[in-house]
């Protein structure tokens, strides 16, 4: 279990840089994470909203705090979800 956990961790950390990329090839991954964020009310993979770099300005719905029951914080003048998605993704992968 610890080995597979390590692999998932490494993969997610490596893929964090894709969120701030601006190429067409990274778009699909970014869109998948946006959908995941909306479903699980989380933000980014490792460092929260900062993972998105300059893309944060281009996707208006990114990480937006829509649920006052969940922990939120201010980032670039916007209320965003405080929790990163890494634990949710690991749980999701473990269940599926």
């Amino acid at each position: 279990k610890s080995k597979s956990d390590r692999i998932v961790n490494e993969t997610l950390y490596e893929n964090t840089k894709l969120l701030s990329a601006t190429g067409e090839s990274e778009k699909q991954f970014q869109e998948a994470i946006i959908v995941f964020q909306e479903e699980f009310k989380c933000c980014g993979l490792v460092n929260g909203a900062a993972d998105w770099g300059n893309n944060f300005q281009h996707y208006p719905e990114l990480c937006a705090c829509l649920d006052k029951q969940r922990p939120c914080q201010s980032y670039n003048g916007k209320q965003v979800y405080k929790e990163t998605c890494i634990s949710f993704i690991k749980d999701f992968l473990a269940k599926n």
Partner: antibody
Framework: EVQLLESGGGLVQPGGSLRLSCAAS????????MSWVRQAPGKGLEWVSA????????YYADSVKGRFTISRDNSKNTLYLQMNSLRAEDTAVYYC?????????WGQGTLVTVSS | QSVLTQPPSASGTPGQRVTISCSGS????????VYWYQQLPGTAPKLLIY???QRPSGVPDRFSGSKSGTSASLAISGLRSEDEADYYC???????????FGGGTKLTV
């Protein structure tokens, strides 16, 4: 080209029910949150409800909470709004919109009239 | 009574510049993006400005948005007759857990 086509509107008596549908095309429906916004005759816009891409999260305006239910069928590229216990003040054109932050594409709307 | 406050009407002559204001609070405009929508007579609304000041492709640069604190504004320069429409501001309100609109501003050219 993004297209949203609402249907299901009509005349209904107070206390009655109606189900609106919105057929979407021209984009990957399952990737987007979807919303309903309404506009009473001669009045401004009022947000009604929104649903996340996979239906985990649903949001409602206080004015419709407990009476309206938003849902979607990603296999059919269709958004729904089940409206129960309808009131005269629910009379409006109901628009289906893609996303919610912001509503970037809108349908042409379907008119719901609640009257006895 | 709308959560966001807009003037009910505004007017200008062709070529002029007009500004429409939108006032809110810290639970909406102050901590969330502002969006502007244009509704031409008898048609569905159309997105004009997102993320306070960004224009979707196809929207002329005569339209510009800005935000300061809990207020936002839409400026239209080089006014044209086809700009005659209703304009609405909108934002998510995290206290209400819902989307809120201004009451709309009817622009007459």
């Amino acid at each position: 080209e993004v297209q949203l086509l609402e249907s299901g509107g009509g005349l209904v008596q107070p206390g009655g029910s109606l189900r609106l549908s919105c057929a979407a095309s021209g984009f990957t429906f399952s990737n987007y949150a979807m919303s309903w916004v309404r506009q009473a005759p001669g009045k401004g816009l009022e947000w009604v409800s929104a649903i996340s891409p996979g239906s985990s999260n649903k949001y409602y305006a206080d004015s419709v909470k407990g009476r309206f239910t938003i849902s979607r069928d990603n296999s059919k590229n269709t958004l729904y709004l089940q409206m129960n216990s309808l009131r005269a003040e629910d009379t409006a054109v109901y628009y289906c919109a893609r996303k919610h932050l912001p509503f970037d594409y809108w349908g042409q709307g379907t008119l719901v009239t609640v009257s006895s | 009574q709308s959560v966001l406050t807009q003037p009910p009407s505004a007017s200008g002559t062709p070529g002029q510049r007009v500004t429409i204001s939108c006032s809110g609070s810290s639970s909406n405009i102050g901590n969330n993006d502002v969006y502007w929508y244009q509704q031409l007579p008898g048609t569905a609304p159309k997105l004009l400005i997102y993320s306070d000041s960004q224009r979707p492709s196809g929207v002329p640069d005569r339209f510009s948005g800005s935000k300061s604190g809990t207020s936002a504004s839409l400026a239209i320069s080089g006014l044209r007759s086809e700009d005659e429409a209703d304009y609405y501001c909108g934002s998510w309100d995290y206290s209400l857990s819902g989307y809120v609109f201004g009451g709309g501003t009817k622009l007459t050219v």
